[in-house]
């Protein structure tokens, strides 16, 4: 069996779909094009995945190896506090907003960044190798 993350257990370990990267127990999709946060979320959901929810500092550090200076949307939003799309609070890293419109979270090789959700950015989707498993 795949070793589960904090939020899910992937029941088996097949390979990931084309253009997805297998890392640990999950498949990751790093986009080539750019979209706003909502469109990025829709893209991931349509592929039985979700905008990247990072479970801990270790996962964040490992993923940052694949990132550049360019920011990518992740499943992080400020709704009365920074929370991941699975509802869990951001508690292993820090992000701060410089203006009231910066309510979505992005990541690059240097860390997390608050941004206006309207900015077109690359994005990262995450899913278990089987589409019928938990999203996170």
């Amino acid at each position: 069996l795949c070793q589960g993350s904090n939020y899910s257990t992937c029941a088996s370990c097949p390979s990931c779909p084309d253009r997805w990267m297998k890392y640990g127990n999950h498949c990751y999709y790093f986009s080539v094009e750019e979209k706003d946060w909502n469109s990025s979320l829709e893209f991931c959901l349509a592929r039985d995945s979700h905008l990247l929810v990072i479970t801990d500092n270790q996962e964040m550090s490992l993923l940052q190896v694949f990132l550049s200076e360019a920011f990518c949307w992740i499943g992080l939003r400020n709704n009365s506090g920074w929370r991941w799309e699975d509802g869990s609070p951001l508690n292993f890293s820090r992000i701060s907003s410089n203006s009231f419109v910066q309510t979505c979270g992005a990541i690059n090789k240097n860390g997390l960044q608050a941004s206006s959700c309207e900015v077109p950015l690359h994005w990262v989707c995450k899913k278990c190798p089987f589409a019928d498993q938990a999203l996170f």
Epitope: S99, F100, V101, Q113, E118, V119, P120
Partner: antibody, heavy 120, light 107 residues
Framework: EVQLVESGGGLVKPGGSLRLSCAAS????????MSWVRQAPGKGLEWVAT????????YYADSVKGRFTISRDNAKNTLYLQMSSLRAEDTAVYYC?????????????WGQGTLVTVSS | DIQMTQSPSSLSASVGDRVTITCRAS??????LAWYQQKPGKAPKFLIH???TLAEGVPSRFSGSGSGTDFTLTISSLQPEDFATYYC?????????FGQGTKLEIK
């Protein structure tokens, strides 16, 4: 190089209307919030209005709310300020300004300004 | 609305002097403060954001500090081109309020 060029200023009578334009170049206009800031002769800076990337959200200073409308045409890389019911106190140099990116709403780049004079 | 108050309103100094301009917010704005320089007949120039982060291309003799309600802009050694009017600005929320300006003149 980021360039913002304002136009449309001039002399207008109280109660009149005017539309200012700001032509943007040297950056991807459709990625940035844009704003108007004004400066009355011999006075300080006053924020007037800000518009989101898509144009779906607009924000105004109380002094111009209901009289001024900020808009943008991303296909034309142009920002607008429609001013109506103009008053003597609206006399100022009007600057177009671009934010710092990602919704960082400081005014990182400024145009050279266009003078609006409201007088009978 | 948050009010921004600068002091002094004007200041005379000489080339080589160390100069400090103060900006006070009417309530806690954390670090959401920008500074601008404006010369007569010109558009303002962006200097600093988040109270202390220098904009690209701004000389290192400029520095910003403070958080909460009290902020300062310091020029460590005045150069002839630094004589201008300086404005602080709250950049987190609406309205984006400016201070009234500090005019830095040659003594």
């Amino acid at each position: 190089e980021v360039q913002l060029v304002e136009s449309g200023g001039g002399l207008v009578k109280p109660g009149g209307s005017l539309r200012l334009s700001c032509a943007a170049s040297g950056f991807t206009f459709s990625r940035y919030y844009m704003s108007w800031v004004r400066q009355a002769p011999g006075k300080g800076l006053e924020w007037v209005a800000t518009i989101s990337i898509s144009g779906g959200s607009t924000y105004y200073a109380d002094s111009v709310k209901g009289r001024f409308t900020i808009s943008r045409d991303n296909a034309k890389n142009t920002l607008y300020l429609q001013m109506s019911s103009l008053r003597a106190e609206d006399t100022a140099v009007y600057y177009c300004a671009r934010e710092g990116g990602y919704g960082n709403l400081w005014f990182a780049y400024w145009g050279q300004g266009t003078l609006v004079t409201v007088s009978s | 609305d948050i009010q921004m108050t600068q002091s002094p309103s004007s200041l005379s100094a000489s080339v080589g002097d160390r100069v400090t301009i103060t900006c006070r917010a009417s309530e806690n704005i954390y670090s959401a403060l920008a500074w601008y320089q404006q010369k007569p007949g010109k558009a303002p120039k962006f200097l600093i954001h988040n109270a202390k982060t220098l904009a690209e291309g701004v000389p290192s003799r400029f520095s910003g500090s403070g958080s909460g309600t009290d902020f300062t802009l310091t020029i460590s050694s005045l150069q002839p081109e630094d004589f201008a009017t300086y404005y602080c600005q709250y950049h987190y929320g609406i309205p984006f309020t400016f201070g009234q300006g500090t005019k830095l003149e040659i003594k």
